[in-house]
């Protein structure tokens, strides 16, 4: 039975040209996290394997930095970066947990962080 919960940074906004940290946290389970995949719609951004380290997709290598921790830093943001991002936790023995973050990249200098929320 999967008892874990993914907590994410929820709906966030950031300025064009700036950077943002995408973070998820898995709680309420003793399952071992073997890997976290970061995806945007149909694209793979990065993989953080607990043992092997990081894979950064070449399409994003100039704008994505690994970390902090299992998170991912997006740099040099453009309006086209607006959209849904997913953290996919591969765990043993539970299986897969998925968290969702919605990022809005704003033209203006006003970019406020949204509230945190949980996805069971």
């Amino acid at each position: 039975m999967m008892t874990g919960t993914i907590e994410t940074t929820g709906n966030i906004s950031a300025e064009k040209g700036g950077s943002i940290i995408l973070q998820c946290h898995l709680s309420s389970t003793t399952a071992q996290v073997t890997q976290v995949n970061w995806e945007q719609q149909d694209q793979l951004l990065a993989i953080c394997n607990a043992d092997l380290g990081w894979h950064i997709s070449p399409s994003f290598k100039d704008r994505v930095a690994p970390g902090p921790g299992l998170g991912l830093t997006l740099q040099s943001l453009t309006v086209n970066d607006t959209g849904e991002y997913f953290c996919i936790y591969h765990t043993y023995p539970d299986g897969t947990y998925t968290g969702r973050i919605f990022l809005e990249v704003l033209e203006s200098s006003v970019a406020e962080h949204g509230a945190r929320f949980q996805i069971p």
Partner: antibody, heavy 119, light 107 residues
Framework: QVQLVQSGAEVKKPGASVKVSCKAS????????MHWVRQAPGQGLEWIGG????????SYNQKFKGRATLTVDKSISTAYMELSRLRSDDTAVYYC????????????WGQGTTVTVSS | DIQMTQSPSSLSASVGDRVTITCKAS??????VAWYQQKPGKAPKLLIY???FRYTGVPSRFSGSGSGADFTLTISSLQPEDFATYYC?????????FGQGTKVEIK
């Protein structure tokens, strides 16, 4: 230039262990992991596992967990793969390979080590 | 484990032919796929990474495409040195797995 030089061919009896080495030169381990892949005669490629020299972490194919042990001696830039409780179907060519820089494809391979398990 | 199924398992072609090899993953692996070339008695060589990026020094006649579960390696004009076995590999999740291989033979 990048080189991965593996130890020589081995002939072992069933139940024995074998330890294959892979000496790396021409690059640093940072941002990379070292992997082992085997190929039975006339067959395809099978990933045994990988080792991250930076963190000391290792990831194994469950098929080999408990029988394969991956290590690295950073001081001499050498990776090792030990396989215990050998069976006849472990007869194969064993390759070491390194992952690309911050990628999980395998961009350089050793020349291969033939391990023959026979009574 | 994710299964990678290549087709065909072998093919005969002539120099100058356009050759297409397909690889189907048993689940969505996004673009986490590489292609390798192996000649008899030799170690595999990386051709394509992340589904469509040509590795350094690989001739432009080799190209890769696809995402999700369906991937293709294309050799636009087969050369004598291209007769070999080709493997796809996924690294979306461990254990990393390879296709069973496609042997390209001379017709």
């Amino acid at each position: 230039q990048v080189q991965l030089v593996q130890s020589g061919a081995e002939v072992k009896k069933p139940g024995a262990s074998v330890k294959v080495s892979c000496k790396a030169s021409g690059f640093t381990f940072t941002g990379r992991s070292m992997h082992w892949v085997r190929q039975a005669p006339g067959q395809g490629l099978e990933w045994i596992g990988g080792f991250n020299p930076n963190s000391g972490g290792s990831s194994y194919n469950q098929k080999f967990k408990g029988r394969a042990t991956l290590t690295v001696d950073k001081s001499i830039s050498t990776a090792y793969m030990e396989l215990s409780r050998l069976r006849s179907d472990d007869t194969a060519v064993y390759y070491c390979a390194r992952s690309s820089y911050y990628r999980f494809d395998l961009d350089y391979w050793g020349q291969g080590t033939t391990v023959t398990v026979s009574s | 484990d994710i299964q990678m199924t290549q087709s065909p398992s072998s093919l005969s072609a002539s120099v100058g032919d356009r050759v297409t090899i397909t690889c189907k993953a048993s689940q969505d692996v996004k673009t986490a796929v590489a292609w390798y070339q192996q000649k008899p008695g030799k170690a595999p060589k990386l051709l394509i990474y992340s589904a469509s990026f040509r590795y350094t020094g690989v001739p432009s006649r080799f190209s890769g495409s696809g995402s999700g579960a369906d991937f293709t390696l294309t050799i636009s004009s087969l050369q004598p040195e291209d007769f070999a076995t080709y493997y796809c590999q996924q690294h979306y999740t461990t254990p990393w797995t390879f296709g069973q291989g496609t042997k390209v033979e001379i017709k």
